[in-house]
Amino acid sequence: HKCDITLQEIIKTLNSLTEQKTLCTELTVTDIFAASKNTTEKETFCRAATVLRQFYSHHEKDTRCLGATAQQFHRHKQLIRFLKRLDRNLWGLAGLNSCPVKEANQSTLENFLERLKTIMREKYSKCSS
């Protein structure tokens, strides 16, 4: 069967997000991937979206992320724009209303996005073969 267009959009957005660092890609987020053995795919997507939403809600107007120059401000705005797009598409793929995120482990946003990209690429390779 064909891959969902949303999945392709997610991978495209993740590629954009992981190609370049910004002032805040080194900040930490909850690492939902550290112990996700008994988690369904839909739950994983839902929880990933929850983590991203927590991040951009907390840091969208964070002065450390907005930086001191118009250039840094622009990059942060782009980062937030992509995170919101990713969040929206992940919710669509998950099809769940809410999900708990209780893990204590942390990872940088950069590493979180890389891990999510790996998972999405694996999913894409399965559905496209």
Partner: antibody, heavy 123, light 106 residues
Framework: QLQLQESGPGLVKPSETLSLTCTVS??????????WGWIRKPPGKGLEWIGS???????DYNPSLKSRVTISVDTSKNQFSLKLSSVTAADTAVYYC???????????????WGQGTMVTVSS | DIQMTQSPSSLSASVGDRVTITCQAS??????LNWYQEKPGKAPKLLIY???NLETGVPSRFSGSGSGTDFTFTISSLQPEDIATYYC????????FGGGTKVEIK
């Protein structure tokens, strides 16, 4: 296809203000994903970034030129402009306008440039 | 301010030769490094962005590598049309160009 065109006087007297305009065609200057810059190349020297302006109107300037530079945007005319005050012979250069940024990336290089306009500072 | 030190300032090579230009940043700039080609009377042309990505339509003989502070630009087989001045440019923190490397044919 997006094109940029610089315009303005080719000769400016010392101590006066150099004024150039860049007209953008084939695309909107108002996109949130892109920004606009000025770069110059003095004869026999290398490229020098002058400054950039973003869709919000916020600007960044080269620290070495900051006290003399103003960049502004006119969205109604799809143009952005450069003003460089108190010019000297050292400001003689080819002046380029360019577009940076991208809709599918966090940031991108200045990839689209105008053809450049030569400005000579002389009395 | 971030300084970009480019070397050599000029070089002469034969058609078919491998040409290498280096660029060193005064501080870590991650992969925010571009390479431009400038020919006399023409606007600079973006060849490589983010240290190693080939801009669309640019011949594959051009390549770039590096991250952090040290970067390399390579022309695998020099062609007559490659006669130009090449510049590195950081855009990690504002924008700074290297001094340029003038490439000539022997």
């Amino acid at each position: 296809q997006l094109q940029l065109q610089e315009s303005g006087p080719g000769l400016v007297k010392p101590s006066e203000t150099l004024s150039l305009t860049c007209t953008v065609s084939g695309g909107s200057i108002s996109s949130e994903s892109y920004y606009w810059g000025w770069i110059r190349k003095p004869p026999g020297k290398g490229l020098e970034w002058i400054g950039s302006i973003y869709y919000s109107g916020s600007t960044d300037y080269n620290p070495s030129l900051k006290s003399r530079v103003t960049i502004s945007v006119d969205t109604s005319k799809n143009q952005f402009s450069l003003k460089l005050s108190s010019v000297t012979a050292a400001d003689t250069a080819v002046y380029y306008c360019a577009r940076g940024g991208a809709s599918d990336r966090i940031d991108h290089a200045f990839e689209i440039w105008g053809q450049g306009t030569m400005v000579t500072v002389s009395s | 301010d971030i300084q970009m030190t480019q070397s050599p300032s000029s070089l002469s090579a034969s058609v078919g030769d491998r040409v290498t230009i280096t660029c060193q940043a005064s501080q870590d700039i991650s992969n925010y490094l571009n390479w431009y080609q400038e020919k006399p009377g023409k606007a600079p042309k973006l060849l490589i962005y983010d240290a190693s990505n080939l801009e669309t339509g640019v011949p594959s003989r051009f390549s770039g590598s590096g991250s952090g502070t040290d970067f390399t630009f390579t022309i695998s087989s020099l062609q007559p049309e490659d006669i130009a001045t090449y510049y590195c440019q950081q855009y990690y923190d504002l924008y700074t160009f290297g001094g340029g490397t003038k490439v000539e044919i022997k």
